[in-house]
């Protein structure tokens, strides 16, 4: 089988601080040393990139400084955290894994994690 399988949880509930974490695991058919992990958000038929990181196997996952994502990697498993989420960001978040180097290239796309975000209720004014 030449396809690369990617597994991720079906549903995740973001914390009251707007933080959601999930694991993205891939079954690598090749011996990649360089891997790219991308989080995509799918709304209707539109797919947009949320964040992406390229890492060397055995090294840490590094997102850009201004990214809303952070993560760690361990073997073929990536622990992803997305922060700054609001209710309007509720949606399907897809984990895409690409084995970049050495060739051959492999693409793996998860089924997506539905992240639910609930904005916290504002604190009532105190009369004290």
């Amino acid at each position: 089988c030449k396809a690369m399988h990617v597994a991720q949880p079906a549903v995740v509930l973001a914390s009251s601080r707007g933080i959601a974490s999930f694991v993205c695991e891939y079954a690598s058919p090749g011996k990649a040393t360089e891997v790219r992990v991308t989080v995509l958000r799918q709304a209707d038929s539109q797919v947009t990139e949320v964040c992406a990181a390229t890492y060397m196997m055995g090294n840490e996952l590094t997102f850009l400084d201004d990214s809303i994502c952070t993560g760690t990697s361990s073997g073929n498993q990536v622990n992803l955290t997305i922060q700054g989420l609001r209710a309007m960001d509720t949606g399907l978040y897809i984990c895409k894994v690409e084995l970049m180097y050495p060739p051959p290239y492999y693409l793996g796309i998860g089924n997506g994690t539905q992240i639910y975000v609930i904005d916290p209720e504002p604190c009532p004014d105190s009369d004290f």
Partner: antibody
């Protein structure tokens, strides 16, 4: 809207070189991997080469490996294909295509014809 | 590499009829990584279907894709005059990226 425009068409003799360009507009070029695909007259589609968004990693079809070089200049929103040691069997319409977020080739240029003949 | 074989080579049909095109992979190509393209004479290919069954932006719902594993199908429910063209399947799950040899849908 996404637009890809190839240039560099021409008739060249076997063994000579030619460089194709693909000017991109309507999207953030530096965020997308790019492909070259060719189509010989009256034939099907053949993938030629791929380059990552940052230009670091490149892949080639066996038929062009060692002869063709794919490159890009993200500051100019342009993709290139340097073709050396051209052969008659390289005669084709060459298309540049964008690798979509989910993997398929979601946008294509109009193509440019390269004829290798003595 | 994954070899894709399309059948039939040519399909002769009339407008309004249903077209069924087949694409068989030499080894399992995950359904997430199978696309269909349409190419009209003298034009560039156009993405119709990706992930075996998802329609690309702006593609009419008379086009549908199905299948998994090694067998995939493109169906055009009712052929319109502008649908007569060549159709290619493609796998994009690993390099080298490969295309089928194409199926020509012509007017009967």
């Amino acid at each position: 809207q996404v637009q890809l425009v190839e240039s560099g068409r021409g008739i060249v003799q076997p063994g000579r070189s030619l460089r194709l360009s693909c000017a991109a507009s309507g999207f953030t070029f530096s965020s997308y991997g790019m492909h070259w695909v060719r189509q010989s007259p009256g034939k099907g589609l053949d993938w030629v080469a791929f380059i990552w968004d940052d230009g670091k990693n490149k892949y080639y079809a066996d038929s062009v490996k060692g002869r063709f070089t794919i490159s890009r200049d993200n500051s100019k929103n342009t993709l290139y294909l340097q073709m050396n040691s051209l052969r008659a069997e390289d005669t084709a319409v060459y298309y540049c295509a964008r690798k979509g977020q989910l993997g398929p080739f979601d946008s294509w240029g109009q193509g440019t014809l390269v004829t290798v003949s003595s | 590499e994954i070899v894709l074989t399309q059948s039939p080579g040519t399909l002769s049909l009339s407008p309004g009829e249903r077209a069924t095109l087949s694409c068989r992979a030499s080894q399992r190509a995950g359904s997430s990584y199978l696309a269909w393209y349409q190419q009209k004479s003298g034009q560039a290919p156009r993405l119709l279907i990706y992930g075996a069954s998802s329609r690309a932006t702006g593609i009419p719902d008379r086009f549908s894709g199905s299948g998994s594993g090694t067998d995939f199908t493109l169906t055009i429910s009712r052929l319109e005059p502008e649908d007569f063209a060549v159709y290619y399947c493609q796998q994009y799950g690993n390099s080298p990226w490969t295309f089928g040899q194409g199926t020509k849908v012509e007017i009967k």
